[in-house]
């Protein structure tokens, strides 16, 4: 059968719109059908038929602070690929995209285990930065998948104050839409 598109991705997320990206299947296709609807919505989804040459679409007139389910099907005449499905929340509407309750849950003289509560939006990944509080040395940075809500920071100096910051990245990796960060200070 016809291969599905792959790599569903989201960017340019606002309260009323976001852009969906995907990777075309290798097979010859005539176009795509993109459907979207709010999660837990039983009505008829909105549907766009898009030419084969496109691999993105901006969905508009969305409801703020709402999780949307987006499905993409590749078409070749009457033949349809299996669904590619993704979910993305719009901004605003009282739904924050900032991680909450960042804390150190375990520590050694040279490492920290941090934990936070995920925001109520789809997070692609978290970007974590840490560095000596008030220090001149550059901060270190790493990422963890959006499915995680803990991270270990190692290689620290004993007895030093560190500032740790967690950003939720909700856009594409090459053009991240980062939330406001949450930060804490901790002395090893």
């Amino acid at each position: 059968g016809l291969d599905s598109p792959t790599g569903i991705d989201f960017s340019d997320i606002t309260a009323n719109s976001f852009t969906v990206h995907w990777i075309a299947p290798r097979a010859t296709i005539t176009g795509y059908r993109i459907r979207h609807h709010p999660e837990h919505f039983s009505g008829r989804p909105r549907e766009d038929r898009v030419p084969h040459s496109r691999n993105s679409i901006t969905l508009t007139n969305l409801t703020p602070g709402t999780e949307y389910v987006v499905s993409i099907v590749a078409l070749n005449g009457r033949e349809e690929s299996p669904l590619l499905i993704g979910q993305q929340s719009t901004g605003g509407g009282g739904v924050s995209d900032v991680p909450r309750d960042l804390e150190v849950v375990a520590a050694t003289p040279t490492s920290l285990l941090i934990s936070w509560d995920a925001p109520a939006v789809t997070v692609r990944y978290y970007r974590i930065t840490y560095g000596e509080t008030g220090g001149n040395s550059p901060v270190q940075e790493f990422t963890v998948p959006g499915s995680k809500s803990t991270a270990t920071i190692s290689g620290l100096k004993p007895g030093v104050d560190y500032t740790i910051t967690v950003y939720a990245v909700t856009g594409r990796g090459d053009s991240p839409a980062s939330s406001k960060p949450i930060s804490i200070n901790y002395r090893t």
Partner: antibody, heavy 115, light 107 residues
Framework: EVQLLESGGGLVQPGGSLRLSCAAS????????MSWVRQAPGKGLEWVSD???????NYADSVKGRFTTSRDNSKNTLYLQMNSLRAEDTAVYYC?????????WGQGTLVTVSS | DIQMTQSPSSLSASVGDRVTITCRAS??????LNWYQQKPGKAPKLLIY???TLQSGVPSRFSGSGSGTDFTLTISSLQPEDFATYYC?????????FGQGTKVEIK
């Protein structure tokens, strides 16, 4: 007979706004993607935007964040809201039926951005 | 973006002449190539789509060929109403892009 009729063009200062309309008839408007294509004076054709049957959109990088395409299927009308206009946006703007193979075009409306 | 290059930029020909315009894509576009005719002060008109399929109502003296990166529009016997500017357009990948145009003038 398919007909597309643009309106709303005119002279606007840099930084200003303008809304173009395209009235469609002779086909089931709601079932088709529609596009805007522009042509600067004495120059070639440049794709501006698409809007698909469900209202989803795509834009050229040169207008992204400044132009918004919308449609009102109950009025068989396509719109192009143009904000933060620049001198380089000066062109005849055409609406065209479908994306990719532009099988029908309007007569165009001239937008001049100048102080 | 895919660049489309037409040649020649302009040509002079007489009624009855066979005219050939070429269009080259900067990368393969399969057969996703369309040709348009535009007369001064008028909107473009679709002549040929998918490289070689004649749009309904277009005279059979117009034909298109090619695939991959090299394409040709041929007018087998130029008529007075054919003096115009011709554009190619790739529809293989977004954004769709046009050639710079070929102006066909009367010799």
């Amino acid at each position: 007979e398919v007909q597309l009729l643009e309106s709303g063009g005119g002279l606007v200062q840099p930084g200003g706004s303008l809304r173009l309309s395209c009235a469609a008839s002779g086909f089931t408007f709601s079932s088709y993607a529609m596009s805007w294509v522009r042509q600067a004076p004495g120059k070639g054709l440049e794709w501006v935007s698409d809007i698909y049957d469900g209202g989803g959109t795509n834009y050229a990088d040169s207008v992204k964040g400044r132009f918004t395409t919308s449609r009102d299927n109950s009025k068989n009308t396509l719109y192009l809201q143009m904000n933060s206009l620049r001198a380089e946006d000066t062109a005849v703007y055409y609406c065209a039926k479908t994306a990719d193979n532009f099988d029908y075009w309007g007569q165009g409306t001239l937008v001049t951005v100048s102080s | 973006d895919i660049q489309m290059t037409q040649s020649p930029s302009s040509l002079s020909a007489s009624v009855g002449d066979r005219v050939t315009i070429t269009c080259r894509a900067s990368q393969s576009i399969s057969s996703y190539l369309n040709w348009y005719q535009q007369k001064p002060g008028k909107a473009p008109k679709l002549l040929i789509y998918a490289a070689s399929t004649l749009q309904s109502g277009v005279p059979s003296r117009f034909s298109g060929s090619g695939s991959g990166t090299d394409f040709t529009l041929t007018i087998s016997s130029l008529q007075p109403e054919d003096f115009a500017t011709y554009y190619c357009q790739q529809a293989n990948s977004a954004p769709t892009t046009f050639g710079q145009g070929t102006k066909v003038e009367i010799k």
